[in-house]
């Protein structure tokens, strides 16, 4: 095969050389970029940045090496448009640094930086941790940072992420209310912050105010659906993110809503109550309190957790007709309190007959295991616990 | 114990070059960072550049850059600073400096050579 | 470059006097050092990466700050502490110095 004129060659089914000196300052319009696999460049010394326009289109790139080249800046979103990304050689060029942000996201198996004049200082905190955890083949590459010394030797008890404070009112909030929460940052270097919402929707109108290092939050007009739900605040230094999530628990007076019994492993009668804060609850029984056992209790599903309400049943192991009757679920909070009843019927009572009738009675003279005329008690599985007196 | 020793003062012409030289003994030559600083009379200091005895990598504030080469000879663990087209301004004392990753700081500094640039 | 502002220029102290150096960088930096000098001597290391004393450092020196606000302070001075002070940084090439202060006798 002739040899290859242009800047950039192919290279087996999906890659591509770029190697001819200097031929290069940008990556833009590479030939075949969104079938690539990888791609080589090397000897470029015009190419000096790596940019997030850079790289569009490459969503299909693995690996990617651009050695012994003028590299002076990778963006910290560069590889937005590469997800797959898993071996990064950027040896030999001159990198002084590179963001953790660039990396983010990556799931890189090889990460190659020797060569170039990096230079320590907390924003190589992260690289610094991939070497001491073995992350990416760093630690094999011993790489130093130019006139200081081993990357492995940089102090780094001044290299945290920020810290954050969220600030959320002592008092009671309820429905209607506007709230202000505030987030107090506090770090070097601090680059970026804010509020992530998605979860709040519609539990309330947001106005947020204020910026580094104190980011303020007003949740104006709060509905009970804001319990559970989180509100974070985030913030960003050249080390990495930190992130606090924090709830308003806005009081509602108690709810709650019973079910149709229902036969599973046990009786089950369902309920669901709300409320914050969670209200107490008590179940009677035809009208009077009902004293839980270890065969008639309540249990609670596991809860949501974003919501308040939570579900549950009474539960009740094999009942008889003598646990038939009205349930009642009384639920309180200091806001209110609220109740529902409900008809259960477990087994029709076996013994439905009026007291003054005769009682029947059954002999089976037939019954080799009665040795006399007396009647045979047929002893049935389910304890009734009731007891009937023959007059 | 560590010790840099710098060469004696040197009185140059403008336009001329002048070549300093810093003997470090007590530690192993090549595995340090050397830096080179100057001041100026009743100036602060200034950063000019470092060079790298285990492989001779060098870098070089933008100021000096083209005008400075750091050097160094393994053999007698010595590194050299030669500073080009002097001007008068190029008067002071200049310094050199070890940068020791273990602690991460300018631990040891030699006695200073005086450079007088004067025509 | 990051540039290094050192407040004050000069003071006037007496022996046993608490004495506070403030140092301040144009943006936010990893670390700070601090280097005394004396008259026709190499500057001397006081504090590295900020707080931690340099070999044979006396404990009355002390030093502190982030970001970009630092302070270096002599708990009680005594007459060997006449000096002038630097502090430099390193968070990014090149290395820069403060312009220094002068610690005088009052």
């Known amino acids: 095969a002739a040899p290859c004129p242009d800047a950039c060659c192919p290279h087996g089914s999906s890659g591509l050389r770029c190697t001819r000196d200097g031929a290069l300052d940008s990556l833009h319009h590479l030939p075949g970029a969104e079938n690539l696999t990888e791609l080589y460049i090397e000897n470029q010394q015009h190419l000096q940045h790596l940019e997030l326009r850079d790289l569009r289109g490459l969503g299909e790139l693995r690996n990617l090496t651009i050695v012994k080249s003028g590299l002076r800046f990778v963006a910290p979103d560069a590889f937005h448009f590469t997800p797959r990304l898993s071996r990064l050689n950027l040896s030999f060029n001159a990198l002084e640094s590179l963001s953790w942000k660039t990396v983010q996201g990556l799931s890189l198996q090889e990460l190659v930086l020797s060569g170039n004049p990096l230079h320590c200082s907390c924003a190589l905190r992260w690289l610094q941790r991939w070497e001491e955890e073995g992350l990416g083949g760093v630690p094999e590459q011993k790489l130093q940072c130019h006139g200081q010394g081993p990357l492995a030797h940089m102090p780094n008890a001044s290299c945290g992420v920020p810290t954050l404070k969220v600030q959320v009112p002592n008092a009671s909030v309820d429905v209607g209310d506007d709230v202000l929460l505030r987030c107090q940052v506090e770090g070097r270097g601090l680059e970026q912050a804010g509020w992530i919402l998605t979860e709040l929707e519609q539990s309330a109108t947001v106005m947020k105010s204020g910026g580094l290092p104190s980011l303020g939050l007003t949740l104006a007009n709060v509905t009970s659906d804001l319990n559970r739900k989180n509100v974070t605040c985030w913030a960003e230094n050249d080390v990495g993110r930190a992130e606090v999530s924090v709830q308003v628990n806005v009081s509602f007076p108690a709810s709650v809503q019973l079910h149709t019994a229902v036969e599973m492993h046990h009786w089950c009668i369902p309920f669901s109550v709300d409320g914050q804060p969670a209200p107490s609850l008590r179940w009677l029984f035809n009208g009077s309190v009902l004293n839980e056992t270890s065969f008639i209790f309540t249990e609670f599903l596991e809860p949501a957790a974003n919501e308040t309400v939570r579900h549950g049943c009474l539960r009740l192991n094999q009942p008889t007709h003598v646990n038939n009757g009205n349930y009642t679920l009384l639920a309180a909070n200091p806001f209110g309190q609220a109740s529902a009843s409900i008809m259960a019927a477990f087994m029709d009572n076996p013994f439905e007959f009026n007291p003054e009738d005769p009682i029947p009675v059954s002999f089976s003279p037939v019954d080799t295991n009665s040795t006399s005329g007396d009647p045979v008690e047929k002893k049935d599985e389910t304890p009734f616990g009731v007891s009937v007196a023959v007059g | 114990q560590v010790q840099l020793v710098q060469s004696g003062a040197e009185v140059k012409k403008p336009g001329a070059s002048v070549k300093v030289s810093c003997k470090a003994s007590?530690?192993?030559?090549?595995?340090?960072?050397m830096h080179w600083v100057r001041q100026a009379p009743g100036q602060g200091l200034e950063w000019i550049g470092t060079i790298y005895p285990g492989n001779s990598d060098t870098s070089y504030a933008q100021k000096f850059q083209g005008r400075v080469t750091l050097t160094r000879d393994t053999s007698t663990s010595t590194a050299y600073m030669e500073l080009s087209s002097l001007r008068s301004e190029d008067t002071a004392v200049y310094y050199c400096t070890r940068f020791y990753f273990e602690d991460w700081y300018f631990d040891v500094w030699g006695q200073g050579t005086t450079v007088t640039v004067s025509s | 470059d990051i540039q290094m502002t050192q407040s004050p220029s000069s003071l006037s102290a007496s022996v046993g006097d608490r004495v506070t150096i403030t140092c301040r960088a144009s943006?936010?930096?990893?670390?700070l050092y601090w280097f005394q000098q004396k008259p026709g001597k190499a500057p001397k290391p006081l504090i590295y990466y900020t707080s931690s004393l340099g070999s044979g450092v006396p404990s009355r020196f002390s030093g502190s700050g982030s970001g970009t606000d630092y302070t270096l302070t002599i708990s009680s001075l005594q007459p060997e502490d006449f000096a002038t002070y630097y502090c430099?940084?390193?968070?990014?090439?090149?290395?820069?110095f403060g312009g220094g202060t002068k610690v005088e006798i009052k």
């Open positions: 007590g530690y192993t030559f090549t595995e340090y960072w």
């Open positions: 430099q940084q390193w968070h990014s090439y090149p290395p820069t």
């Open positions: 943006s936010s930096i990893s670390w």
